[in-house]
């Protein structure tokens, strides 16, 4: 028998430095997790202690602080190098940038192969990404060869920025071949390394023939086994193991996300490159764990950047916005409406001629609007300010939710109205009217919502039965702020952008913003 | 295939300047950085710099920096290594080479600079 | 700057050998290492990355090992063909070569 360790890290999502328990900026250091230079001393000491080690990351390292804003993707490169990391699936948010974004700083510099299967580039892309990507690879390791083949899920193109000439296949359609190739090759340990969430996980484990593990990413999956170390729920034992429809055992795991965990895998394989066993569990990167000081000296150097950014002038604002809870707990403020113009703004992608957007709705809960904006600051705007108003480092993500789970989740933001609770919600795209004479539950008298597939976009009203894509807080989508029903109802959830990221990506953009109040939405008179 | 073939063989003057061609085919001239390595007569490889075809940005051995000043044309998809105020042990066969996972894979087929009074 | 010490400086072996050179760092260089090939009058060959990873079309008598300031290059089973001088290169900082090994038939 031969014993393979996998360390695994998945939706990293630009953690560089240690972090909160709940991954947000790191306040008291004594209570921090995760973050490159304490990875780096967990990987380092396995290494040692083990012989056949690798080290893999299931996609997603971009998007999610400031590190990413600044530095495009040059950072990740020179971290994983300096890691040493084995191999890396491509993952959506790689692909925030475009295709340039993703090929200079990161596919040029990365001393590690790359991977994905399942993304085929056609025109001009086709030459000049030859190469730069693979959709597997073979690693030495000891005396034994790994397959490690790569795999992105093929939503990419609603959920990035990928162009026009990057094909996004079925998964497994596009993973069996290349296993067949390996197996030609007289490769007989075979890794499915990708970001395609927890459920393609599973199928690919079940469907592909002839891949022994899956890594995985894009759900920020937890799995455990045992009492969890620290504050999320295992969504299953880790690894999750699935019969293949040929009648193996294939072990599928996960580790959650933001480089919390260290995912820790050990396979045996009989010499016919079967998987005998596999146990092992995600390494809880707390501060029991020392941060490697060379590491640490380098993120300090890399961290000077970054404070300089953050006073920068990123455009300018010729109005007040109105982020005070005063206003965005009890009515339609003029900084949620700059929030959610940002938040649509940042997801037109144009994939269907018969669709102007795939997504036209946004909503917002007033609570996580934090400060206004003073214009009188000679209109200045930094990303310093958007911290303030956006201080919890969360994501604006696309969600699928029935009309009926719209409706009730806009019930749920007045039922309590006027204690100035966080629920209330801002919009775009939308047109809500609500009755607070009426009882608690059936307040809401109109809802009409943009359309997306017409070339003049309209408000319509929204029909209970038809599927909407939304952009929200991820906040909102983890069912925050009471909003149960959406966390227990949606039909797809995809994690996205960094908030303060797409706000000022917005603001840089348009330059100079006059947000306004303007009717999105209104009290039925009498009422209010 | 992947092709670099670079310019002929060079005889300078001491104190002159030199620049060497490198013209890529087979791939995308700007999606791979490309080195500079020298070797002398009957010695070992030496690397010199390397540039990113893209955006013109280049690292240096800190021997040559004073001396040598890497460029590219991407619209003939070429590299150029031009190294100045020569000197007899600049005489050396003078390789460009591509680079892939930080190292380099692809080598052109060598030109020797020979500096002599 | 990073120095590399290669050696032997050149080595005699007879048909089948196994043939061993070694490359030491003067600092970690997190496997960073990669093995040339240079016949005479030749461009040097790219046989092996990170180490021990080979490069495509390599036989497989040619192997790379080792990690942190130590590495070894080995040919399993000499072969007329091998004659050459061999260089190791690290490009954990930037680039440096070993002095290089020239390998020849006894």
């Known amino acids: 028998a031969w014993e393979l360790t996998i360390l695994h890290t998945n939706d990293v999502h630009s953690r560089l430095e240690q972090t909160s328990e709940d991954s947000s900026k790191c306040v008291n250091a004594s209570r921090c997790m995760g973050g490159v230079a304490r990875l780096f001393t967990k990987v380092q000491q396995i290494r040692r202690a083990e012989p056949n080690v690798l080290l893999l990351d299931a996609g997603d390292q971009y998007q999610g602080t400031i590190w990413f804003t600044v530095y495009k993707g040059a950072e990740v490169a020179h971290f994983m190098n300096a890691l040493r990391y084995d191999a890396m699936a491509l993952g959506n948010h790689e692909f925030d940038n475009g295709v340039e974004g993703l090929i200079e700083p990161l596919l040029k510099e990365a001393k590690f192969p790359i991977l994905s299967a399942n993304i085929k580039a056609k025109g001009p892309l086709a030459s000049q990404i030859s190469g730069l990507y693979l959709p597997y690879k073979v690693l030495p390791v000891g005396d034994e060869v790994v397959g490690i083949v790569g795999y992105t899920s093929k939503e990419t193109p609603f959920l990035s920025n990928p162009g026009t000439n990057l094909v996004f296949e079925d998964e497994i359609t596009a993973l069996q071949p290349e296993v067949d190739k390996l197996k030609t090759l007289n490769v007989n340990k075979i890794i499915a390394l990708g970001h395609s969430g927890f459920e393609m996980d599973k199928l690919i484990a079940q469907k592909v023939r002839g891949v022994d593990v899956v890594v995985g990413g894009h759900s920020n999956t937890f799995l455990y086994t045992g009492n969890p170390p620290s504050k999320e729920v295992p969504a299953g034992k880790y690894p999750f193991i699935v019969t293949s429809d040929d009648g193996r055992k294939v072990p599928v795991v996960q580790a959650y996300a933001f480089g919390k965990y260290l995912g820790y895998l050990k396979i045996e394989f009989d010499e016919r490159g079967n998987v005998i066993s596999s146990h092992g569990n995600p390494i809880l990167l707390n501060s029991s764990i020392p941060e490697d000081p060379s590491i640490k000296a380098d993120i300090n150097k890399w961290r000077i950047k970054l404070d300089n950014y953050s006073t920068q002038e990123l455009g300018k604002t010729i109005v007040y916005l109105d982020g005070s809870s005063q206003s965005c707990r009890f009515r339609e403020c003029n900084m949620g409406n700059l929030i959610c113009d940002a938040m649509i703004n940042n997801n037109l992608r144009h994939t269907d001629e018969m669709f102007w957007n795939h997504v036209s709705m946004c909503i917002l809960n007033g609570g996580g609007i934090r400060s206004p904006i003073d214009e009188r600051n000679n209109g200045t705007i930094t990303w310093e300010n958007l911290a303030a108003v956006l201080p919890f480092g969360g994501t604006f993500d696309l969600v699928q939710l029935k009309g009926s789970t719209l409706k009730k989740a806009f019930e749920h933001s007045v039922h309590r109205y006027g204690q100035s609770t966080g629920e209330f919600l801002q919009v775009g795209g939308i047109h809500v009217v609500y009755d607070l004479s009426r009882k608690p539950g059936d307040r809401v008298v109109k809802l009409d919502v943009l359309c997306t597939k017409c070339r003049v976009p309209s408000y319509d009203p929204l029909k209970m039965d038809e599927v909407y894509k939304v952009i929200l807080p991820n906040f909102l989508a983890n069912g925050g702020d009471g909003f149960q029903m959406i966390k227990d109802e949606l039909l797809r959830h995809d994690s996205g952008d960094q908030d303060i990221n797409v706000v000022s990506t917005y603001i840089s953009k348009m330059k100079v913003i006059y947000p306004a109040v303007e009717g999105r939405i209104k009290f039925s008179t009498g009422s209010h | 295939q992947v092709q670099l073939v670079q310019s002929g063989a060079e005889v300078k003057k001491p104190g002159a300047s030199v620049k060497v061609s490198c013209k890529a085919s087979?791939?995308?001239?700007?999606?791979?950085?490309m080195h500079w390595v020298r070797q002398a007569p009957g010695q070992g490889l030496e690397w010199i710099g390397e540039?990113?075809?893209?955006?013109?940005?280049?690292n240096y051995n800190e021997k040559f920096k004073s001396r040598v000043t890497l460029t590219r044309d991407t619209s003939t998809s070429t590299a150029y290594m031009e190294l100045s105020s020569l000197r007899s042990e600049d005489t050396a066969v003078y390789y460009c080479?591509?680079?892939?996972?930080?190292?380099?894979?692809?080598w052109g087929q060598g030109t020797l600079v020979t500096v002599s009074s | 700057d990073i120095q590399m010490t290669q050696s032997p400086s050149s080595l005699s072996a007879s048909v089948g050998d196994r043939v061993t050179i070694t490359c030491k760092a003067s600092?970690?260089?997190?496997?960073?290492l990669s093995w040339f090939q240079q016949k005479p009058g030749k461009s040097p060959k790219l046989l092996i990355y990170?180490?021990?990873i080979w490069v495509d079309g390599v036989p497989s008598r040619f192997s790379g090992s080792g990690s942190g300031q130590d590495y070894t290059f080995t040919i399993s089973s000499l072969q007329p063909e091998d004659i050459a001088t061999y260089y190791c290169?690290?490009?954990?900082?930037?680039?440096?070569f070993g002095q290089g090994t020239k390998v020849e038939i006894k």
């Open positions: 080479a591509r680079r892939v996972y930080g190292t380099m894979d692809y």
């Open positions: 087979g791939y995308t001239f700007t999606s791979y950085w």
């Open positions: 540039i990113n075809p893209s955006i013109g940005r280049t």
């Open positions: 600092q970690d260089i997190n496997s960073y």
């Open positions: 990170r180490a021990n």
């Open positions: 290169l690290q490009y954990d900082e930037l680039y440096t």
